[in-house]
Amino acid sequence: AESHLSLLYHLTAVSSPAPGTPAFWVSGWLGPQQYLSYNSLRGEAEPCGAWVWENQVSWYWEKETTDLRIKEKLFLEAFKALGGKGPYTLQGLLGCELGPDNTSVPTAKFALNGEEFMNFDLKQGTWGGDWPEALAISQRWQQQDKAANKELTFLLFSCPHRLREHLERGRGNLEWKEPPSMRLKARPSSPGFSVLTCSAFSFYPPELQLRFLRNGLAAGTGQGDFGPNSDGSFHASSSLTVKSGDEHHYCCIVQHAGLAQPLRVELESPAKSS
């Protein structure tokens, strides 16, 4: 239930960006909600979705921007350390999670071209890894003025402080529950069969369960699809192949935190679904 007790920054840099696209971008996440976006073209950290309305201190977004500009400089500097032909994609996952006892557990790991290769060692206060690329980048970053100290501060102090602030100031966003709007439709499939599709739209949080019943008995969960919407909500669907003419024996059951109890969704009449 406390899946939102984490603050994670997903950082990505590319050595050869396409024209007009950023070389570096970041998404910031409070649990399953994206609250921040940043890219090297705009150069400003900006709130996402409902977090635009969060009652934050005046300098909050300036501080996020300052920190991410430092990260941008480091990430792009990494490509100089790597040399070679490339192209390279460097990713970072930085952040913290609050444990049950309210202590903060930091995360700092890095991947090159999709392979995890380096982390930030909190005890040593340095970046480290066994691979040559980890060595190349960590040496370069270590040479940057106070970079390791800034990383330590970011992970051990800034991140948990921000997370606790968001838990207080943005509690409404974090406790947001949006029940799904539902549809159950049938369409012809291969000869003698139909596909039933149970769709859930605009719900939050993302945890949702869809299953089919036939004459009140479990008929499986079908083949599923799930994804985010631009407003921070989610959509999901599940499809089941049934015999033609048998469609009306089926219904779909949805369970979600925004619903007081499981909701039964009946098949739409052909006239309504046109």
Partner: antibody, heavy 118, light 106 residues
Framework: QVQLQESGPGLVKPSETLSLTCTVT?????????WHWIRQPPGKGLEWIGY???????NYNPSLKSRVTISRDTSKNQFSLKLSSVTAADTAVYYC???????????WGQGTLVTVSS | EIVLTQSPATLSLSPGERATLSCSAS?????MHWFQQKPGQSPRLLIY???NLASGIPARFSGSGSGTDFTLTISSLEPEDFAVYYC?????????FGQGTKVEIK
Amino acid sequence: QVQLQESGPGLVKPSETLSLTCTVTGYSFTSGYSWHWIRQPPGKGLEWIGYIHDSGGTNYNPSLKSRVTISRDTSKNQFSLKLSSVTAADTAVYYCAREENYRYFDVWGQGTLVTVSS
Amino acid sequence: EIVLTQSPATLSLSPGERATLSCSASSSVSYMHWFQQKPGQSPRLLIYSTSNLASGIPARFSGSGSGTDFTLTISSLEPEDFAVYYCQQRSSYPPTFGQGTKVEIK
């Protein structure tokens, strides 16, 4: 075109130190490659030993770490392998290789056979 | 460390036949590389990052796979393809090689 050439004694006595050098031609140690030693006992598979990066940093196979040292001489465009306290089990063809783009070994030396025997 | 197991140990085929070599990893890896080695020669890179053909390698060689199971395929064996083939991973430290598959003339 980059070429690698291993050199060193072909016979080493047990408990002594094996020393090999790899000479790199067509490239100088300046830009983002790593340089590796790999060995192959007669009739067997390949075993990675360790690397030195263009930056000068090194790392070794945990199974050999206590006995291995890899170093370089940029003025001669060479990097070297030292393996101490050798036994008959260290008899192998030793290859030097370059790792391209932090992905794969694209250039190999022709290999040199080192026999450990008294 | 990740152990790579190649099968079969030996593959006896005739020129023109299709060769399928397998490499199984003890844990999931992102990519696999393949090398060819002929007697008295050093290994030569054939396929990098699972499916990319190295420079100068003929198109009859192809690679595929993901997770723990990877395959090298030679669509139609030429006389010069009879050699030992090794898979290699560098997803998990240290880098490791398979024990090799020998492709011999039947």
